[in-house]
């Protein structure tokens, strides 16, 4: 049958040959393949300024296979499309275009955003965060003892990170100041060596803490007796209570 086609076409093309290569049923020196063997696709291959017919088992990038009764050819995808399933359904767009429902768009429709990695129009995703954890114990420098004024923290997880146009994530941790009844650190918490030195240092820190929290400008340089200290602390506590009534509570948020 193919031989018959090759023989017949010799009337139209002086150089038609039956001894074709690469899946051609009929071919010529000038045009390359004229027709293809069954199941192969005809495509024009550009070689410089010349176009040569070739027969392929599948179509090259930028083309899709069209099958008609006994005649198959590679048909170009639309001008903005790199890879397509058929004329109306693109699977990969050319540079600068975004894929949406098989079409190539230069910008994404409302309610969608461009994913510059996949070059697709995707739904806008907003941030989702979990509920807050309970507040942590009141702490200072990683300890829960040896101070009156510390900080407590609570955290939450990001359940869904936002896409480029999505709502930003809220803070994932929150810290606030807290006041507790000062309790002495046990031996294990203080360490064995230099307890006296540490006690002096602690007292100094407490003074720093209380003086700064009561808006005092200077710091006492002398070391106070336990009685003086207790008296002073009582006064500071009263001041703090009065201030706290006004201020309710101080809260600091930090994003991590």
């Amino acid at each position: 049958q193919n031989a018959s086609r090759g023989r017949r076409q010799r009337r139209m093309h002086p150089n038609v040959s039956q001894g074709c290569q690469g899946g051609c049923a009929t071919c010529s020196d000038y045009n390359g393949c004229l027709s293809c063997k069954p199941r192969l696709f005809f495509v024009l291959e550009r070689i410089g300024m010349k176009q040569i017919g070739v027969c392929l088992s599948s179509c090259p990038s930028g083309y899709y296979g069209t099958r008609y009764p006994d005649i198959n050819k590679c048909t170009k995808c639309k001008v903005d499309c790199d890879t397509c399933f058929n004329k109306n359904f693109c699977t990969k767009c050319k540079s600068g275009f975004y894929l949406h429902l098989g079409k190539c768009l230069d910008s994404c429709p409302e309610g969608l955003e461009a994913n510059n990695h996949t070059m697709e129009c995707v739904s806008i995703v907003h941030c989702e965060a979990s509920e807050w954890s309970p507040w942590s114990p009141c702490m200072k420098k990683g300890k829960t003892c040896g101070f009156k004024r510390g900080t407590e923290t609570r955290v939450r997880d990001i359940l869904q990170h936002p896409s480029a146009k999505g709502n930003l994530c809220p803070p994932t941790s929150e810290t606030r100041t807290c006041i507790v009844q000062r309790k002495k650190c046990s031996k294990g918490e203080r360490g064995k060596k230099g307890r006296e030195r540490k006690r002096k240092k602690l007292n100094k820190e407490e003074r720093k803490e209380t003086s700064s929290s009561s808006d005092s400008k200077g710091l006492e340089s002398s070391i106070e007796t336990p009685d003086q200290q207790e008296n002073k602390e009582r006064q500071q506590q009263q001041k703090r209570r009065a201030r706290d009534k006004q201020q309710k509570s101080v809260s600091v948020s930090t994003v991590h």
Epitope: R8, G32, L44
Partner: antibody
């Protein structure tokens, strides 16, 4: 030289079936693709369909429910049937051949036959 | 279906003149374009296929060019026998479609 010749009635009544034959000489209809094309008054051409070397057919979707293309290899002829004709089907009907995408399309045409649809 | 828009629809030209007829497709037809000529009372005659390839026996004054959606047929030096109606035809996909024709007459 390949030659194609259309034949059939020149007048058909509305709602009847238009039947034409294309007789081919100089080539076998078991090679290539054998087509029907029509030209309406006013010079507008319409592609109707083809029958391939193996006997498979393609019909223009605009005519699909009404058109049938068949062949008789022993006579080296192929046929067109168009059902339920109206005056809109008045045209000159041509048969033509091509051999593949890399060669000339409609390298050979019949001389055409005018079919008038009228009561 | 692909629409082929041919222009002009008719024209007058002098013998020896260079004539160009254009055909614009509604989408890229990848060079699968043919030109044929029809004279009154005669069957069509294919002149050019695959945009720029001359059918055997067609005078070399006929040439075709183009790509994508835009194609043209040029007659380098018009001769009397060139009068008739010229049509473009695409065969990039089925159904094939034709231009409406350009009637070429001698001045």
């Amino acid at each position: 030289e390949v030659q194609l010749q259309e034949s059939g009635p020149s007048l058909v009544k509305p709602s009847q079936t238009l039947s034409l034959t294309c007789s081919v000489t100089g080539d076998s209809i078991t090679s290539g693709y054998w087509n029907w094309i029509r030209k309406f008054p006013g010079n507008k051409f319409e592609y109707m369909g083809y029958i391939s070397y193996s006997g498979k057919t393609y019909q223009n979707p605009s005519l699909k429910s009404r058109i049938s293309i068949t062949r008789d290899t022993s006579k080296n002829q192929y046929h067109l049937q168009l059902n339920s004709v109206t005056t809109e089907d008045t045209a000159t009907y041509y048969c033509a051949t091509y051999y593949g995408y890399g060669g000339p399309w409609f390298a050979y045409w019949g001389q055409g036959t005018l079919v008038t649809v009228s009561a | 279906d692909i629409v082929l828009t041919q222009s002009p629809s008719s024209m007058y030209a002098s013998l020896g003149e260079r004539v160009t007829i254009t055909c614009k497709a509604s989408q890229d037809i990848d060079s699968y374009l043919s030109w044929f000529q029809q004279k009154p009372g005669k069957s069509p005659k294919t002149l050019i296929y695959l945009t720029n390839r001359l059918v055997d026996g067609v005078p070399s004054r006929f040439s075709g060019s183009g790509s994508g959606q835009d194609y043209s047929l040029t007659i380098s030096s018009l001769e009397y026998e060139d009068m008739g109606i010229y049509y473009c035809l695409h065969y990039d996909e089925f159904p094939l479609t034709f231009g409406a024709g350009t009637k070429l007459e001698i001045k």
